[in-house]
């Protein structure tokens, strides 16, 4: 090879250590110190016998044909940085990687980057019970699902608890309650889903609401009214209260539903 006529241009390859779960993309960045006129960028993996196995070659915004398409090289807009990605990493992709640049004739020069290690771990949904280490970071979709399910469960539990408190603590109150039917069809979740009943909140009209609200006096029970929960399509007695078992599938009230189960 010709002796290099140009200044030595080191390559960097980062991160030095990268851990991804199987199925995720693993991306290294190979960076040139400067942008030569003409060069080829090679991406290598170190074999068990300490030889470099070429994964992909890149030149002038094109990648060598016929190579494994899981190994992708993409030039970034600054022209000096290149993303080297393994698409859907497999466990056996774990190993040592590096990049190399060949500065093309007339002044051929070959340059190699430092090495970097990739660890591809098994995909685990929950951490092992005996392991003290923290659970692997959940992917965005999974995290969203867990948060969503948790929120719904907490909401339903709170609603059940509140209903139970109201039903158990306060005496039957029939005065002022208005039983109003709803034309909305019951919600269906699927062909096999049990019938779900929505809660209909009667609109309660209280004269004292016209005035500016004041903090309730500690001993003024006459100022407090309670809504009665009525399930359409079932025989409703004037003094019927909802029990915890009758609230399966009940939807929490939305703001448009008017007053909820709170003391009014």
């Amino acid at each position: 090879l010709d002796s290099p006529d140009r200044p030595w241009s080191p390559l960097t390859f980062s991160p030095a250590q990268l851990t991804v779960q199987e199925g995720e993309n693993a991306t290294f960045t190979c960076s040139l110190a400067d942008i030569p006129d003409s060069f080829v960028l090679n991406w290598y993996r170190l074999s068990p016998r300490n030889q470099t196995d070429k994964l992909a070659a890149f030149q002038e915004d094109r990648i060598e044909p016929g190579r494994d398409r899981r190994f992708r090289v993409t030039r970034l807009p600054n022209g000096r940085d290149f993303h080297m990605s393994i698409v859907a990493a497999r466990l056996n992709d774990s190993g040592i990687y590096l990049c190399g640049a060949i500065y093309l004739p007339p002044n051929t020069q070959i340059n190699e980057s430092p090495r970097a290690e990739l660890s591809v771990t098994e995909r685990t949904l929950e951490p092992p019970t005996q392991s003290p280490s923290p659970p692997p970071r959940l992917s965005g979709q999974l995290q969203g699902l867990v948060i969503g399910v948790t929120s719904v469960l907490v909401g339903v539990l709170l609603l059940l608890l509140l209903t139970w408190v109201l039903a158990a603590v306060f005496p039957r109150a029939t005065r002022g309650a208005c039983v109003c039917g709803s034309e909305d069809e019951p919600l269906k979740e699927g062909p096999d889903a049990a019938p779900v009943f929505t809660l209909d909140y009667g609109e309660l009209d209280f004269q004292w609401r016209e005035k500016t609200p004041e903090p309730p006096a500690p001993c003024a029970p006459e100022q407090t009214e309670y809504a009665t929960i009525v399930f359409p399509g079932r025989p409703a007695s004037p003094g019927r209260r909802a029990s915890a078992s009758s609230l399966q599938g009940a939807q929490p009230p939305s703001p448009e539903d008017g007053p909820g189960l709170w003391p009014l």
Epitope: T52, D53, A57, E60, P65, T108
Partner: antibody
């Protein structure tokens, strides 16, 4: 100065397998470069056959009967072409390229292979 | 495969005279990166081919400036402004945009 030298039989019988070796001196056979075989049939143009660069890539016209390999310790690379016919009579060149396209910088002198019974 | 067609297949030129070889590709050799991958090779009698020009118009080191390449898309030309005795040989065009790489049949340049 890098030199490439082809060696092998000058005469092959039809249906036999051609084996050629390219010995490289003044440089190393490594997967940094592309080590090609190109042939030139009588009254025809140049025909790229394939290369080795740590892995192999072949011209589909030869797929199934062409094999290119390299021995980096011995500093040579080789060609095997099976099911030879008279149409395979040609001068065979080993060629180094610094990228995968026809950017060839060093050529062997070529070896004439005749297929005849 | 991309077919490369050269014309003429034979050319007889007097020393000092210009010479021109045409090469037509069956499809465009322009890549989306802006480069056109068209090459010219010369094979002197009894020798191996050597590349003269890469990417349409770039001369390889040591190639005299009497040689020039031009063209775009599918039509390309190699010109020798003043032919010398040393220029005799077979000239090939080749493409590097689509695998497999293919070459023209060659144009034989003889001196009168």
């Amino acid at each position: 100065e890098l030199t490439l030298q082809e060696s092998g039989p000058g005469l092959v019988k039809p249906s036999q397998t051609l084996s050629l070796t390219c010995v490289v001196s003044g440089g190393s056979v490594t997967n940094i470069f592309y080590w090609n075989w190109i042939r030139q049939r009588p009254k025809r143009g140049l025909e790229w056959m394939g290369y080795w660069s740590g892995y192999t890539h072949y011209n589909p016209a030869f797929q199934g009967r062409l094999s290119i390999d390299a021995d980096t310790a011995q500093n040579h690379f080789s060609l095997q072409l099976s099911s030879m016919t008279t149409e395979d009579t040609a001068v065979y060149y080993c060629v180094r390229g610094y990228i995968w396209t026809p950017d060839y910088d060093y050529w062997g002198q070529g070896i004439l292979v005749t297929v005849s019974s | 495969d991309i077919v490369m067609t050269q014309t003429p297949l034979s050319l007889s030129v007097s020393p000092g005279e210009p010479a021109s070889i045409a090469c037509k590709a069956s499809q465009s050799l322009l890549h989306s990166n802006g480069n056109t991958y068209l090459y010219w090779f010369r094979q002197k009698p009894g020798q191996s081919p050597q590349r003269l020009i890469y990417k349409v118009s770039n001369r390889d080191p040591g190639v005299p400036d009497r040689f020039s390449g031009s063209g775009s898309g599918t039509d390309f030309t190699l010109r020798i402004t003043r032919v010398e005795a040393d220029d005799a040989g077979v000239y090939y065009c080749g493409q590097g945009i689509q695998d497999p790489w293919t070459f023209g049949e060659g144009t034989k340049v003889e001196l009168k």
